[in-house]
């Protein structure tokens, strides 16, 4: 029977004739930076080439006994998970291994840096097809390691890393915290986060998605035909490296941004029990378990978007938080969130020639998050239109006035300290969906984009009684680009996108002691691209 992990990443209604890239990843080379490996294991022999690269520290302890099978254990297993004949994800992928971890599984930042440089030089000397680099290791936060990952990613290499097994915020570790790297957490057969002794998978906003990482059968370095189960975020990352190899083999021209968006899009959504994560991390941690796409066709026409959370601003009065999209992505909307509800909104602003999303803390607030909605929108021309606070009691409003530009997101930002309470509701005039409205004391920012065939519509869901959470989702075929709250009398903590659903959170009714705070309305902006749809039809 198929191992649970391979079954899990195989989408429902999967048909062999429908998704078969040439030999399951054969056009892709996967570099593995790990321990030494047993390359003559029949699961991987002929598929893994051991490079002459080795940069490892001495093993600790005077009585350490270097046993080949133990030295090779971690790397051999991971090579098997990526491309093993029987238990591998991408059975056609070829691999190259670099030894950066010693027999105790320890390495150094410098060793890993030199390994990454070795790959970069190899790529320059002998350019091949798409490259995936698997980094199944985690150490303390390292600015220099993250920078090296960024350089390699910008050279067109896909880097996949383990989130770490410390039951902690992945942003505290490297290379997991590098934004350019695809960071993978681990789940088990029940789609629950993996517990490893007293610890377990890392979590948080630096994790891109989860993948099977408990009781994973793979090649064992004990013998040429041995298999063993291992667990951890390394195994999870190996699954995603395999999936990436499959996707890149089917579509070799995919950019890192496109690949990441597809990994997110085709993941199983909302299957992880978030109660395992610390309460403050639940909203930040993606509820996504990696899966292979059901088909190589039909993905190209979709408008792909993902949600990017900033780091926490910190509690100081003027603190801000910034969320950024990847270089190839467009920022289509910006929202903010504060657990205390004390915030001064958010705005989209230019920084280094690119739009970023900045959220503002308020006096007495415990800090804010900025939430960017980052999308793949080829040939897009986006700009931000701002309306300063209005004098009129009707409130502030702004719309996209340029011909062919459509509204993709609304943000509001205010200077007054606490704009969430005791303000009269503002009603959107009917028949004017292409505009943003807000409090008269607030500046309103509209994200307006022109792209071939782009069309958007506004969808609202209002609840008259106070609710902790109000949601509105885009229907099939449409992608959520913007998520905000219509100004009302209820105290809104913020708004954010979860997959294709806009979530507006309000202060817990039980803590306010009042049940007459009024309506909460979630506003979703849903878009689609007719141009992308037509382009994909022409290709087939």
């Amino acid at each position: 029977s198929i191992p649970w992990n391979l079954e899990r990443i195989t989408p429902p209604r999967y048909r062999a004739d429908e998704y078969q890239p040439p030999d399951g990843g054969s056009l892709v080379e996967v570099y593995l930076l790990d321990t030494s490996i047993q390359s003559d294991h029949r699961e991987i022999e002929g598929r893994v080439m051991v490079t002459d690269f080795e940069n490892v520290p001495e093993e600790d302890g005077t009585r350490f006994h270097r046993q080949a099978s133990k030295c090779d254990s971690h790397g051999t297993h991971l090579a098997g998970v990526v491309s093993g004949r029987d238990a591998g994800v991408a059975k056609g992928a070829s691999m190259r291994s670099l030894r950066v971890l010693n027999c105790q599984g320890k390495g150094t930042v410098s060793g890993t840096l030199i390994g990454l440089e070795f790959i970069r030089k190899s790529q320059l000397v002998q350019p091949v097809g798409p490259l995936v680099v698997l980094l199944p290791l985690a150490g303390g936060y390292s600015r220099v390691l993250n920078a090296a990952c960024q350089r390699l990613a910008r050279a067109g290499v896909v880097l996949v890393t383990a989130a770490g097994n410390f039951r902690d915020d992945a942003c505290l570790y490297s290379p997991a915290s590098a934004p350019e790297v695809i960071t993978v957490g681990a789940t088990n057969a029940q789609d629950q986060p993996v517990t490893l002794g007293t610890l377990g998978t890392n979590f948080g906003r630096c994790v891109d998605l989860f993948a099977p990482g408990e009781d994973i059968i793979g090649a064992s370095s004990d013998c040429s035909t041995c298999f063993v189960s291992q667990s951890g975020t390394s195994q999870a990352a190996a699954h995603v490296a395999g999936i990436a190899a499959m996707m890149l083999s089917a579509e070799p021209e995919l950019t890192l941004a496109e690949l990441r968006q597809r990994l997110i899009h085709f993941s199983a959504k909302d299957v992880i029990n978030e109660a395992w994560f610390p309460e403050d991390q639940r909203v930040l941690t993606p509820n996504l378990v990696a899966a292979l796409p059901p088909s190589t066709h039909g993905a190209g026409w979709q408008l792909f978007c993902r949600t990017v959370w900033s780091a926490h601003s910190g509690p100081t009065r003027m603190a801000t938080a910034v969320a950024r999209c990847a270089p190839d992505e467009e920022l289509l909307s910006c929202s903010s969130f504060s657990r205390s509800g004390k915030r001064r909104g958010e705005r989209m602003e230019a920084q280094g020639g690119k739009l970023v999303c900045r959220a503002h803390n308020a006096f007495g607030g415990e800090g804010v998050y900025a939430i960017a909605r980052c999308c793949l929108l080829p040939q897009a021309n986006c700009s931000v239109h701002t309306a300063p606070p209005a004098e009129a009691s009707m409130g502030t409003r702004v719309h996209c006035h340029q011909q062919g530009h459509v509204l993709t997101g609304c943000s509001s930002h205010w200077e007054v300290e606490d704009l969430g309470t005791h303000k009269p509701p503002v009603l959107r005039p009917r028949g004017q969906p292409n505009q943003c409205v807000g409090h008269r004391e607030a500046s309103i920012h509209a994200s307006c984009c022109h792209a071939p065939g782009l069309e958007c519509k506004v969808k609202e869901h209002g609840i008259p009684a106070p609710q902790e959470q109000v949601t509105v989702a885009c229907e099939e075929g449409w992608t959520l680009t913007g998520c905000s709250a219509l100004p009302g009398t209820s105290h809104v903590l913020g708004a954010y996108a979860v997959d294709n659903t806009c979530v507006v959170r309000s202060r817990d009714v039980s803590t306010t002691g009042s049940t007459s705070e009024g309506a909460v309305t979630a506003v979703a902006i849903c878009c689609r691209s007719r141009h992308l749809a037509q382009a994909s039809q022409e290709l087939q």
Epitope: R47, R85, D86, K91, I217, S220, C223, C226, S229
Partner: antibody
Amino acid sequence: QVQLVQSGAEVKKPGESLKISCKGSGYSFTDYYISWVRQMPGKGLEWMGLIYPGDSYTRYSPNFQGQVTISADKSISTAYLQWSSLKASDTAMYYCARDHGYRPYSDIWGQGTLVTVSS
Amino acid sequence: DIVMTQSPDSLAVSLGERATINCRSSQSVLYSSNNKNYLAWYQQKPGQPPKLLIYWASTRESGVPDRFSGSGSGTDFTLTISSLQAEDVAVYYCQQYSSFPITFGQGTKVEIK
């Protein structure tokens, strides 16, 4: 049902070439290894080598390396064992058997092909 | 290569009696990472291909009568037929499948006394 069906008995002269076959059915042929095992008259079992039809990976016993060639055609779910120049000492019963990666024992065997090499 | 040695070479047992075959490997076929012995037992009747009886040293293949049992670990293994039946007359082979080349014992012939 799962089975391996081997080609019929062969009588050959020394120096001739030969290719015998083993066709799998009732299972995913590319997901299992096929081993070839020799049994000389009145003797025990000797493992010759294997192939993984999924990617044609082969592994030979040192005793048979260079003496025989193992191949497969996954499009027709068939594995082959061939000799370019037979010797009288190649007279034996040849079995194919399948095994799985993490279940590396041979659970299904072909009925055998008797090869007789005689001048 | 791992050398597999069976004893005895042949064995004559009365119907209904116990038959015991031993197999020794020149090196351990027990692996600590998964705690499995990479050893199988096969039965070959005259004019037939071998048939899998036992794998992982002690796991009976489905459809094999429960009078067949395997035991042992590391380098020493035993196949036991608890109550010999007429249809059990055959040659029995042990096999290690952990290391290449895969190797078989020389075989033990079981007959009825």
